[in-house]
């Protein structure tokens, strides 16, 4: 008795965060024995779509020509081989931006901050929202997720960072959203450039010091509770 078929890999191109009206392609990669691919969308009738494999049969393409609210959500895919259906892929969260007006992102006390000190990024929306997200360009885990407590609607969210180090420098944007669908985000805020100057740091290189890239985990203003990435997309502070 053979074990279960290996789960396929699911991804989106050009990415999983798509502006309204833009095209996106969802790919599901299984094995060369695949005869059919199925894509399921959470809270939609299954299957959401079926596709025959592309040669050499190890993957299938699901095309979305123009991103709208209907396409935002959580997807899984499967493939069928002569011995049956595979395990489900890991989920893909397809997020649409442009659902609401853009918030404003600012830095307190200033976007120019000295290494070793603190800075608070403030994301403000015109209308009350219950979820705010912070993105750092070229970060490995780009989205930080702040949900208002007790479902309260708020006009702003604070993202504290301390101590700030050189890797916190870079370009940030924020989004706002409503709790009923975390897959629908506002337009992005205008970019905020955080500039880290000076240094209170030890100037001596230590033997274990490694080169830190912009994609390193130090980019994240980690929260003391619930700081584990959620489905690879968000970090929670709730």
């Amino acid at each position: 008795q053979a074990g279960p078929l290996p789960k396929p890999t699911l991804w989106a191109e050009p990415g999983s965060v798509i502006s309204w009206g833009n095209s996106v392609t969802i790919w599901c990669q299984g094995t060369l024995e695949a005869r059919e691919y199925r894509l399921d969308k959470e809270e939609s009738p299954a299957p959401w779509d079926r596709q025959n494999p592309l040669e050499p049969k190890n993957k299938a393409r699901f095309s979305i020509p123009s991103m709208t609210e209907d396409y935002a959500g959580r997807y899984r895919c499967y493939y069928r081989s002569p011995v049956g259906w595979s395990q489900p892929s890991d989920p893909l969260e397809l997020v649409m931006t442009g659902a609401y007006s853009k918030p404003t992102l600012s830095a307190l006390p200033s976007p120019l901050v000295t290494s070793g000190k603190s800075v608070t990024l403030l994301c403000q929306s015109r209308s009350p929202m219950d979820t705010f997200l912070l993105i750092k360009e070229r970060a490995a885990h780009p989205l930080l997720h702040l949900r208002s407590e007790h479902g309260a609607q708020q006009h702003q969210a604070e993202f504290p960072m301390s101590p700030v180090t050189s890797v916190h420098g870079g370009t940030y944007r924020c989004f706002s959203s409503h709790g009923f669908s975390h897959y629908l985000l506002s337009h992005p805020s205008d970019p905020l450039e955080l500039i880290v100057s000076g240094s209170l740091e030890d100037p001596r290189p230590s033997p274990t010091r490694s080169v830190s890239t912009a994609a390193g985990p130090e980019d994240q203003p980690l929260m003391p509770t619930g700081s584990v990435p959620h489905s690879g997309l968000r970090r929670h502070w709730e």
């Epitope: 307190l108 006390p109 290494s115 070793g116 000190k117 603190s118 608070t120 604070e158 504290p160 960072m161 301390s162 101590p163 180090t165 050189s166 890797v167 209170l200 740091e201 030890d202 230590s206 274990t208 010091r209 490694s210 080169v211 830190s212 390193g216 985990p217 130090e218 994240q220 203003p221 980690l222 929260m223 003391p224 509770t225 700081s227 584990v228």
Partner: antibody, heavy 118, light 107 residues
Framework: EVQLVESGGGLVQPGGSLRLSCAAS????????MHWVRQAPGKGLEWVAY????????YYADTVKGRFTISRDNAKNSLYLQMNSLRAEDTAVYYC???????????WGQGTLVTVSS | DIQMTQSPSSLSASVGDRVTITCRTS??????LNWYQQKPGKAPKLLIY???KLHSGVPSRFSGSGSGTDFTFTISSLQPEDIATYFC?????????FGGGTKLEIK
């Protein structure tokens, strides 16, 4: 469950050296900055040193600068404090603590006692 | 360095009492103020972070407030297990600094 376990404390003569270790488990060690904090017998808490998650940023209290070296090995989930030129006033319980990115330290080890005496 | 002035240094209260500890900083630290509880022979435990956020697993009788330079820590109804020393700590600028502590005793 987050766990931090310090080791390496003991009795050392003034001018001597000691290396403290902190073994971390229950969380993704490589994603968190780490601190050393000490507490002299019957006294308050004193922050000693900080190292960022990727070791790119290191900070020390003025009282230990030039004598202590903080380091980490993310592959081994371990934090270290190399203490040289020890003085009587370095006598304390040394705690390792996990940083949060918000200026707090959310989990602490049980501590290891360092006694500097002739 | 940022100086931390914590008061009172000791406090005696009865079970069920409302207990308040204050912490004043030598410069504005925004909301980067944390509170810890330490019992004899044990490591400190984080109770409150970022002035008013309750750390996971901490009972709701503990709360914090303030901003800038003046901060308050409150136990709404003192329980026997709350007997400990409490410390405030600023996380605004390295080096982190702590208040001198408040030793809380049962009357």
């Amino acid at each position: 469950e987050v766990q931090l376990v310090e080791s390496g404390g003991g009795l050392v003569q003034p001018g001597g050296s000691l290396r403290l270790s902190c073994a971390a488990s229950g969380f993704t060690f490589s994603s968190f900055g780490m601190h050393w904090v000490r507490q002299a017998p019957g006294k308050g808490l004193e922050w000693v040193a900080y190292i960022s998650s990727g070791s790119s940023s290191i900070y020390y209290a003025d009282t230990v600068k030039g004598r202590f070296t903080i380091s980490r090995d993310n592959a081994k989930n371990s934090l270290y404090l190399q203490m040289n030129s020890l003085r009587a006033e370095d006598t304390a319980v040394y705690y390792c603590a996990r940083g949060t990115g918000t200026g707090a330290m959310d989990y602490w080890g049980q501590g290891t006692l360092v006694t500097v005496s002739s | 360095d940022i100086q931390m002035t914590q008061s009172p240094s000791s406090l005696s209260a009865s079970v069920g009492d409302r207990v308040t500890i204050t912490c004043r900083t030598s410069q504005d630290i925004s909301n980067y103020l944390n509170w810890y509880q330490q019992k004899p022979g044990k490591a400190p435990k984080l109770l409150i972070y970022y002035t008013s956020k309750l750390h996971s697993g901490v009972p709701s009788r503990f709360s914090g407030s303030g901003s800038g330079t003046d901060f308050t820590f409150t136990i709404s109804s003192l329980q026997p297990e709350d007997i400990a020393t409490y410390f405030c700590q600023q996380g605004n600028t390295l080096p982190w600094t702590f208040g001198g502590g408040t030793k809380l005793e049962i009357k």
